[in-house]
């Protein structure tokens, strides 16, 4: 290969300009890797390698800087880009280079890494009495941290679990909703409430249980006064 010493720079630029890259549709290999293929219209001695440029695309990512993966083997026409974010749509392009000189960009192609279930729970889960005189509670939360969502959050699952299955209540809301009202809680039953985000790959990590128990008037019982039904029964049994 020629070096930049004693090389006609105009010739380098001209040859790099003629070396048009055609990017094929990328192949998604996993939740964190994408394989990129390309062909060169006109091979040249003045191609030292290829720069594969990629970045997350979409409204919520803005115009982020291009990340660069260098391929320093001119004969090579494919590469696997590793360490990508899960469930993220990427725009990808390629360009040839020779030392500090760079050729024209290929067309841009798009590929989305595979989603995984979120690896962190929703944040800031709160459980409170809902307005009104019924036995309903309001469960609120914030999404998991963005880098743990591992894709687009499609829905949130809420589990409101009493001490027996007949007291269980499950709710599902869409991914843009961050609260849900759960009606008809049974007074005197201690419920644990958990929330998890779900992507297309499934349900993620559940939040730490939050406990709530309503008294006969439908008002929350303070945590130190919360006693399970089983405990109440066992206390009665222990009485002489």
């Amino acid at each position: 290969l020629p070096t930049s010493q004693g090389v006609d720079h105009k010739q380098v630029q001209r040859e790099l300009g003629n070396a048009v890259l055609h990017l094929h549709n990328p192949t998604v290999l996993s939740s964190s890797s994408i394989e990129v293929h390309w062909t060169v219209d006109q091979q040249s001695q003045y191609i030292q390698g290829y720069k594969i440029l990629y970045r997350p695309s979409g409204a919520n990512h803005g115009e982020s800087d291009w990340l660069v993966f260098e391929v320093r083997t001119p004969a090579k026409n494919s590469v696997v880009i590793p360490d990508l974010r899960k469930g993220v749509n990427y725009e990808i392009k390629a360009r040839p280079f020779f030392n500090e000189f760079q050729g024209a960009d290929s067309e841009i192609k798009f590929a989305k890494t595979l989603e995984e279930a979120p690896s962190a729970p929703p944040q800031g889960v709160t459980v409170s009495k809902n307005d009104g005189n019924g036995t309903a509670i309001l469960v609120s939360w914030q999404p998991p941290p963005e880098d743990t969502q591992n894709g687009m959050v499609q829905e949130y699952k809420v589990w409101c679990l009493g001490n027996e299955t007949r007291y269980h209540i499950n709710k599902t809301v869409d991914g843009s909703t961050f609260s849900v009202v759960i009606p008809f809680l049974v007074p005197g039953i201690r419920y644990s409430v958990e929330v998890a985000a779900s992507t297309g790959a499934g349900s993620g990590v559940k939040s730490e249980p939050q406990f709530i128990q309503l008294d006969a008037h439908g008002n929350p019982v303070s945590p130190e006064d919360q006693v399970s039904l089983a405990q109440q029964i066992s206390d009665v049994v222990k009485q002489p």
Partner: antibody
Framework: LQQSGPELVKPGASVKISCKAS????????MNWVKLSHGKSLEWIGD????????TYNQNFRGKATLTVDKSSSTAYMELRSLTSEDSAVYYC????????????WGQGTTITVS | IQMTQTTSSLSASLGDRVTISCRAS??????LNWYQQKPDGTVKLLIY???RLHSGVPSRFSGSGSGTDFSLTISKLEQEDIATYFC?????????FGAGTKLELK
């Protein structure tokens, strides 16, 4: 909960009625069926868990009613077989979260006449 | 569990206080719900867990009782309350209903 229209059927025949759910997540609630007849008031037929198709029947309706769901269309179905005049009634679908919770929404009812 | 509504029909005037009773054949704790069936057949939940008012139900409706004896009260009867009222227990399978009390105008 939107139920299918009235049915006039012959004795010995079968009939399948539907209940289409909208406005909530279909798999979050048990779907129940209730019979309203002049002689016997309201009778709970049974329920189905849309998520997995699990059913629980009132013993009195075992062999008479079969409950199914189609998750893709958020629709519950009840088939009644070997119909007799005793089966002439209004049939309601109704939802609840679990057994101790009330039926908070009901369909408008489907009238079945066996004649 | 058998649910008994002893009064099958009840006549009252607009503005009256009306009480409908329901008895369970065994202790059902507070797992007692009341439903209203209008003449056109539509059914609505009124009261759950004996005394809790379902959202959107007028405050003239109230419920009370525990164990085996329960009642539904309408403090001031209005025209739109003319309907049949059913109690239902949620304590034990199979779920069972009372025979209904039909409320009519005098």
């Amino acid at each position: 909960l939107q139920q299918s229209g009235p049915e006039l059927v012959k004795p010995g025949a079968s009939v399948k009625i539907s209940c289409k759910a909208s406005g909530y997540t279909f798999t979050d609630y048990y779907m129940n069926w209730v019979k309203l007849s002049h002689g016997k008031s309201l009778e709970w037929i049974g329920d189905i868990v849309p998520n997995n198709g699990d059913t629980t029947y009132n013993q009195n309706f075992r062999g008479k009613a079969t409950l199914t769901v189609d998750k893709s269309s958020s629709t519950a179905y009840m088939e009644l077989r070997s119909l007799t005049s005793e089966d002439s009634a209004v049939y309601y679908c109704a939802r609840f979260s679990n057994y101790v919770y009330p039926f908070d929404y009901w369909g408008q009812g489907t009238t079945i006449t066996v004649s | 569990i058998q649910m008994t509504q002893t009064t099958s029909s009840l006549s009252a005037s607009l503005g009256d206080r009306v009480t409908i009773s329901c008895r369970a054949s065994q202790d059902i704790s507070n797992f007692l719900n009341w439903y209203q069936q209008k003449p056109d057949g539509t059914v609505k939940l009124l009261i759950y867990y004996t005394s809790r008012l379902h959202s959107g139900v007028p405050s003239r409706f109230s419920g009370s009782g525990s164990g085996t004896d329960f009642s539904l009260t309408i403090s001031k009867l209005e025209q739109e309350d003319i309907a049949t009222y059913f109690c239902q227990q949620g304590n034990t399978l199979p779920l069972t209903f009372g025979a209904g009390t039909k409320l009519e105008l005098k």
